[in-house]
């Protein structure tokens, strides 16, 4: 059933991983770096999909993820045979207001305690991740091991 209450604006939040690295926009790419003075981490814009009835149940809350104030949204697309994470110029509210879920831009948001994971709706089993080494771009991975971090701390801003 469609959510009856229509939302006018996305929520805002900040994200860091378990190694206290934050997301920073560099040359139209999101990278995870240790927090430092005079650094400007991105503020995340997120909003739930209105059409949960057409998506798989029990995988998490389907959400659109964007960069607040920048008209950029995270999306998943195949490059060759490999699902990749990309930033696309798209208004998050345009995605929210569509009569269908836009799967390429949707992520199942799951929370366990303070940890959040973001699984691609378009490519189930693939999660937003950062390399454990840091200073690297955000990627999609299906390997939930030590090489990549898929757990993030999401703090909502009011």
């Amino acid at each position: 059933m469609e959510k009856a209450l229509k939302i006018d604006t996305p929520q805002q939040g900040s994200i860091q991983d378990i190694n206290h690295r934050v997301w920073v926009l560099q040359d139209q790419t999101l990278i995870a770096v240790p927090r430092k003075d005079r650094m400007s981490p991105v503020t995340i814009a997120l909003i739930s999909c209105r059409h949960v009835e057409t998506l798989e149940k029990d995988r998490g809350n389907p959400i659109y993820l964007g960069l607040n104030g920048l008209n950029l949204c995270l999306m998943c697309a195949k490059v060759g045979d490999q699902p990749t994470l990309q930033l696309k110029e798209k208004d998050i509210m345009d995605l929210y207001n569509q009569p269908e879920p836009v799967k390429s831009f949707l992520f199942y948001h799951s929370q366990s305690g303070r940890n959040s994971t973001f699984e691609s709706v378009a490519f189930p089993g693939w999660f937003i991740a950062v390399s454990s080494e840091g200073g690297c771009p955000l990627i999609l991975t299906q390997e939930l091991g030590k090489a990549n971090t898929t757990d993030f701390g999401l703090t909502m801003l009011f």
């Epitope: 059933m1 469609e2 009856a4 229509k6 009835e53 057409t54 998506l55 798989e56 697309a77 345009d94 995605l95 207001n97 569509q98 009569p99 269908e100 836009v102 799967k103 390429s104 378009a122």
Partner: antibody, heavy 123, light 111 residues
Framework: ELQLQESGPGLVKPSETLSLTCTVS??????????WGWIRQPPGKGLEWIGS???????YYLPSLKSRVTISVDTSKNQFSLKLSSVTAADTAVYYC???????????????WGQGTLVTVSS | QSVLTQPPSVSGAPGQRVTISCTGS?????????VHWYQQLPGTAPKLLIY???NRPSGVPDRFSGSKSGTSASLAITGLQAEDEADYYC???????????FGGGTKLTVL
Amino acid sequence: ELQLQESGPGLVKPSETLSLTCTVSGGSISTSSDYWGWIRQPPGKGLEWIGSIYYTGNTYYLPSLKSRVTISVDTSKNQFSLKLSSVTAADTAVYYCSRVRYGVGVPRYFDPWGQGTLVTVSS
Amino acid sequence: QSVLTQPPSVSGAPGQRVTISCTGSSSNIGAHYDVHWYQQLPGTAPKLLIYGNDNRPSGVPDRFSGSKSGTSASLAITGLQAEDEADYYCQSYDYSLSGYVFGGGTKLTVL
């Protein structure tokens, strides 16, 4: 068996407002899973989705028609309606109403359809 | 110009197999949106023939089948019969247009 029936004038003058109503029988318009939609087909041409409505009143419109279209629902009469303003000859078409169904993982589809009503825009 | 591209016409003799293609793009069929097919007999309203790429509603003969690959889909009709002569339309969703889209239609002639 669910049935839909369009009704309204078959002739509308240019610049006026086209008004059609779809009456649903054999089922409730207030079902939580379905939308209700309008599709049109100009003579000898293909199909074009106009817009859809949920029983709560949530609407979605084809962006290119959005400024001229209003779809409304009357759950007490089991009806939904289409208004298209400032019509021109290009709006001459057979107008169909339909239930807009969903399946998990697939975009919504139209089933069943009303028989359609031809609306001619002419002075 | 329709967003989904279909051949204007196809033909076949009774008993033969014909296919109708439906080509889209990365913002519709290629964006994880399935394809539905409708049959429109002369002078009547369209009727759902295939939904979700390859599912037949009850009452649709198994001579009709659908498939999807990449940014394209196709409808196959085997054992062609005279009553199959109709227009066939594919339908999907396009997120860049924020709307449901149809192919231009294919007229099937049974020779």
